[in-house]
């Protein structure tokens, strides 16, 4: 099944997505596409990067963190509800089958009409450290428990937890990575 | 224009290994979206994917294949190819390369090579 | 591994004639359906792909339309060249299949 993330109409989605390069620089191609991951490739392909830069993309539709650093996670700009659906974030990792797919669902409500700061529920991943979140509301801090190391079969269930759009945000600074190499 | 040309023996004998090379010409076989395949046509059948390598080096084969089958690529030559080892008659195809291009739903196609009949046998 | 069953095996029309193509997966494949047309001694050629997405280049007479396990490929009025044999094929599941094809002759 599915890791479900949201967001609401005219906001910025957000969808994570991470490596870790063998080394500084040695990066490996990422594909995103609208619809659930094929054999190979991307469905409908809206961003693509290679070895050294983002080398196709469609408008909405960018890398907001350091995809150099491994963090390829996507961001689509003042989303609609023709938005929602599966994505796919493909990883093509060098060797035989190795490929890395995960399948995000991300799904649009509409705008609140009257949006009032709102407190963020429980967030139970198991990270080894504290986030705040941040733009939307008062900042809180959410005290989280410890994880050892993150594998590639563990970060699709530790995904799991992130299904608030804009606390997936916090993410990107988690330590929650695929280790390549 | 990307074409395709394949180069190889159109014998081989049995237990012997199938290596053919396609030759890409018109663009690099390190541009993004192509998936450089090899697929096969048995005489007066269907088709059957050998596999594919990605020019990252990620590679598919066909688990059918896969004990005996080697897909690489020479990026200094611009060439992919295609090793299949202990052939037996029931390898005796027509061997084809082949690109696919992916980029969004309003560009996709494909490019093959012209074909290569190859016979097994003593 | 998907097995994609193409129906009918031939089929036999004129010129102008409107051809029906099914084509039926053994389990879902999403819209992750192509079609291709080939010819004797020619390499298969991409004329649809994921379902109903006509590739580069290909004439707006032919058509794809379906999802889950279960295609069509219409070609609305069929020019002289277009009689050969077609074939789908499924890149949802690995490894990637073709269906045993549809032979489009003339009556």
């Known amino acids: 099944s599915e890791v479900e993330y949201r967001a609401e109409v005219g906001q910025n989605a957000y969808l994570p997505c991470f490596y870790t390069p063998a080394a500084p620089g040695n990066l490996v191609p990422v594909c995103w596409g609208k619809g659930a991951c094929p054999v190979f490739e991307c469905g409908n392909v809206v961003l693509r990067t290679d070895e050294r830069d983002v080398n196709y993309w469609t408008s909405r539709y960018w890398l907001n963190g350091d995809f150099r650093k491994g963090d390829v996670s996507l961001t689509i700009e003042n989303v609609t509800l023709a938005d929602s659906g599966i994505y796919c974030c493909r990883i093509q990792i060098p060797g035989i089958m190795n490929d890395e797919k995960f399948n995000l669902k991300l799904v649009i409500k509409p705008a609140k009409v009257t949006p009032a700061p709102t407190r963020q529920r429980d967030f139970t991943a198991a990270f080894p450290r504290m986030l705040t979140t941040r733009g939307h509301g008062p900042a809180e801090t959410q005290t989280l428990g410890s994880l050892p190391d993150i594998n590639l079969t563990q970060i699709s269930t530790l995904a799991n937890e992130l299904r608030d759009s804009r606390l997936a945000n916090d993410l990107r600074d988690s330590g929650a990575t695929i280790r390549i190499g | 224009q990307v074409q395709l040309q394949q180069s190889g023996p159109g014998l081989v004998k049995p237990s012997q290994t199938l290596s053919l090379t396609c030759t890409v010409s018109g663009g690099s076989i390190n541009s993004g979206g192509h998936y450089w395949s090899w697929i096969r046509q048995h005489p007066g059948r269907g088709l059957e994917w050998i596999g594919y390598?990605?020019?990252?080096?990620?590679?598919y084969y066909n688990p059918s294949l896969k004990s005996r089958l080697t897909i690489s690529v020479d990026t200094s030559k611009n060439q992919f190819s295609l090793k299949l080892s202990s052939v037996t008659a029931a390898d005796t195809a027509v061997y084809y390369c082949?690109?696919?291009?992916?980029?969004?739903?309003?560009?996709?196609?494909?490019?093959w090579g012209q074909g290569t009949m190859v016979t097994v046998s003593s | 591994e998907t097995t994609l069953t193409q129906s009918p095996a031939t089929l036999s029309l004129s010129p102008g004639e409107r051809a029906t193509l099914s084509c039926r997966a053994s389990q879902s494949v999403s819209s992750y359906l192509a079609w291709y047309q080939q010819k004797p001694g020619q390499a298969p050629r991409l004329l649809i792909y994921d379902a109903s997405n006509r590739a580069t280049g290909i004439p707006a007479r032919f058509s794809g339309s379906g999802s889950g396990t279960d295609f069509t490929l219409t070609i609305s009025s069929l020019e002289p060249e277009d009689f050969a044999v077609y074939y789908c094929?499924?890149?949802?599941?690995?490894?990637?299949?073709f269906g045993q094809g549809t032979k489009v002759e003339i009556k």
């Open positions: 390598i990605y020019y990252s080096g990620s590679i």
């Open positions: 082949a690109s696919y291009y992916y980029a969004s739903s309003g560009d996709a196609f494909d490019i």
């Open positions: 094929q499924q890149r949802s599941n690995w490894p990637p299949t």
